[in-house]
């Protein structure tokens, strides 16, 4: 099997472009790995890092879409093997990590889809920063005890109601002075 | 100006429960989040735990989470911090604090001015 | 989270510049710019003196700098006075699960 992976019926955008499924010829893309299973309304879909794309460009696309059972089946035993380690006795592990085991599990941070790639819906705006020169969002999803800061101008676009919400809740019409920064 | 004002000192038995309280004035109370932060004799600062008042939703340090309760009752703007058994471990100075901003995420700017919690049989 | 680290004591003489480390790991310091740092005298409570890394509330002196490198962050106090002398403490964002982890604490002696 070739990887590759033919992408007519979601339309994936590539640079922007969305691409039309009325083309003759729909654009083959060719997926790297497989990084995340998911079920949605019973449909298993994949989270794919893509050949010649950033990490930016990840998406999850329905199984009966994909043509690279190699990268899943190597996804699906790495998450075995992965629960059978977990599963295994500790009595062996010194207290510290080896360092193996530490670049692993920073591998597996900067693997793990961020923010809205996630895929899951996003329940409210736990705080806001702009302390990276950009405005981002603190948000936690549903049915997760984990949150993300995530890009307030993606927010705006995805979940306007909830940050119509978080503005109205932390809405103060009195300006204090001590409050403000210098 | 902005105000948290804390409960007085209690000395309490190891096994009871205990209720603290931090009123807030001169803002919008349920505009912020409301953290409790524990000090220990002659330690550092530790963070253990926030509550937004407009709904009480929260969020625990782990270390804290399921030894305390942190709830608010916005009507009279007050947030708690209470324990249902005691520990000697858990005497300590504890302050409530309220960030600067309505939307800051792990910064505060005004802070109560103590609750001592003595736990002695 | 384990607390962050922060050197036990530092000193300095007045009109002197003192800095002041935080080290954390890539979860906490490493990865947000969420960085505050706390100054407290005996018996009182904490005074918020840097917050986002470099930002100072008003009514905080110009002297107090805030500023961040990979895992570490660092407070610095130029023009050294004898009322800066005080416990300092640091705290960052540490993820959803944490949320915020604080450092043990530097004592500043400013001699003299």
């Known amino acids: 099997a070739s990887n590759k992976t033919t992408l007519q019926k979601m339309g994936k955008k590539q640079n922007g472009k969305s691409k039309k499924v009325e083309e003759a010829e729909p654009e083959e893309f060719v997926v790297e790995k497989v990084l995340d299973r998911r079920v949605v309304n019973g449909k298993v879909e994949y989270f794919l890092k893509w050949k010649g794309f950033t990490d930016a460009d990840n998406t999850w696309e329905p199984e009966e879409n994909l043509d690279c059972p190699e990268l899943i089946e190597a996804f699906l035993n790495s998450q075995k093997a992965g629960k059978e380690k977990d599963g295994t006795k500790r009595k062996s592990l010194s207290d510290s990590e080896s360092d193996d085991s530490k670049s692993k599990k920073k591998r597996d941070a900067a693997d793990k889809p961020r923010g809205f790639a996630r895929g899951l819906d996003p329940e409210r705006i736990i705080g806001a920063t702009d302390s990276s020169g950009e405005l981002m969002f603190l948000m936690k999803w549903k049915d997760s005890d984990e949150a993300d800061l995530v890009l307030a101008k993606e927010a705006n676009m995805k979940c306007p109601q909830i940050v119509i919400a978080f503005y109205e809740e932390r809405l103060t019409w009195h300006s204090c002075p001590e409050d403000e920064a210098q | 100006a902005v105000q948290l004002v804390q409960s007085g000192a209690e000395v309490k038995k190891p096994g009871e429960s205990l209720r603290i309280s931090c009123k807030g004035s001169?803002?919008?109370?349920?505009?912020?989040?409301i953290s409790w932060v524990r000090q220990m004799p002659g330690k550092g600062l530790e963070w253990m735990g926030r509550?937004?008042?407009?709904?009480?939703?929260?969020n625990y340090s782990p270390s804290f989470q399921g030894h305390v309760t942190i709830s608010a009752d916005k009507s009279i703007s007050t947030a708690y911090l209470q324990w249902s058994s005691l520990k000697t471990s858990d005497t300590a100075m504890y302050y409530c604090?309220?960030?600067?901003?309505?939307?800051?995420?792990?910064?505060?700017?005004?802070w109560g001015q103590g609750t001592l919690v003595t736990v002695s049989s | 989270a384990s607390a962050l680290t922060q050197p036990a004591s530092v000193s300095g003489s007045p009109g002197q510049s003192i800095t002041i480390s935080c080290t954390g790991t890539?979860?906490?310091?490493?990865?947000?710019?969420?960085v505050s740092w706390y100054q407290q005298h005996p018996g009182k409570a904490p005074k918020l003196m840097i917050y986002?890394?470099?930002k100072r509330p008003s009514g905080v002196s110009n002297r107090f700098s805030g500023s961040k490198s990979g895992n570490t962050a660092s407070l610095t106090i130029s023009g050294l006075q004898a009322e800066d002398e005080a416990d300092y403490y640091c705290?960052?964002?540490?993820?959803?699960?944490?949320?915020?982890?604080f450092g043990g604490g530097t004592k500043l002696t400013v001699l003299g």
């Open positions: 604090a309220r960030p600067l901003q309505t939307y800051s995420i792990a910064s505060v700017g005004h």
């Open positions: 001169g803002y919008s109370f349920t505009s912020y989040w």
């Open positions: 509550i937004d008042p407009s709904d009480s939703y929260t």
């Open positions: 890539s979860s906490d310091v490493g990865s947000y710019n969420l």
């Open positions: 986002e890394g470099s």
């Open positions: 705290c960052s964002y540490a993820g959803s699960s944490t949320f915020a982890v």
